[in-house]
Amino acid sequence: LSEEADDTDSELGSMKPLHTFCAMKADDGPCKAMIRSYFFNMYTHQCEEFIYGGCEGNENRFDTLEECKKTCIPGYEKTAVKAASGAERPDFCFLEEDPGLCRGYMKRYLYNNQTKQCERFVYGGCLGNRNNFETLDECKKICENPGGGSGGGLNDIFEAQKIEWHEGGPPHHHHHHHHHH
């Protein structure tokens, strides 16, 4: 075995956003409106929800999750189109369960190649591999039935599961995926 048995470094370490503004922190601005918006989180490599105040802020703000992904996730549109057009299952769907070595307690889903189904497992929060999804729906769209959906729900196939628990993020961070106990 190598130092990190599934070589997550090569899969995750070189992620660069498409535009420099994608690296900006979420900025809710000084106003008091409560507008659900989305930003690209450099640390998780995911588009996430935040509450925008309605004025000022910065360019790392999108009205829809899809718009955020298209703008900031490298290769997102290509991958989404591929999954939607009945393309083959990504290789990482065949990786075996890897909970990592940290002490987080995160309910996640993986594709089980024996049962050909997405199943629940507990992820420790660090290392691990890309066969690791925050929702059952996401797992199914990517691994169980890659040609069966619109591709719109393909939630960051580049895998942002490196964090132990993302509660240290930007202000007004209401991203619902990370707070399972």
């Epitope: 130092e3 048995a5 640390y43 660090c126 290392l127 691990g128 132990e164 240290g168």
Partner: antibody, heavy 116, light 111 residues
Amino acid sequence: EVQLVESGGGSVQPGRSLRLSCAVSGLTIDNYAMQWVRQRPGKGLEWVSGISGNSRSIGYADSVKGRLTISRDNAKNSLYLQIDSLRADDTALYYCAIFLHESDYWGQGTLVTVSS
Amino acid sequence: QSVLTQPPSVSGTPGQRVTISCSGSTSNIGTMYVHWYQHVPGTAPKLLIYRNNHRPSGVPDRFSGSKSGTSGSLAISGLRSEDEADYYCLAWDDTLRAYVFGTGTKVTVLG
């Protein structure tokens, strides 16, 4: 009662190798990540390596990469640490630990002394 | 050289409240949990706080943890003589891809 007992420490010359073991009783380790932590004389705690329950995720501190190999045998309920090319600064008390979600189990440590 | 910095020592008299800081960065405390340990050299470290602010069963509620941004903090209220020990923070560092302990803080109970 859960017990972790380290063994394999001792006095060894620089350049030699040593294999530390950690035997666990009172808990089946299959599903748990395990760690090695050391404390050098007069220094603080230092995490050196960790391994997931199924051995698929393995991590090492930069300071030991290339010289340490962590492994486990779930059938024997044991954790191991192979230390190669021992150096004087590997002299330390080595603890094995299991970090659970809401608690920890630690051994009492095994002392490794490297000197010529 | 640890990437998590703690004050080398803090002291207080019995009954006082003392706090220990643990300063890190976005790649560790900023996006990860911080955990706290009490350690008497030569014995097994004891987990005091896990996941920022949770106490394991058996740990007195005099010990509390918090996190803000890239720093963690451990507070000991109602200081007692048996609290004399070394205290360490611990977090996973996503850049180093390793757990890192803080530099350690020696707590001394005066008088």
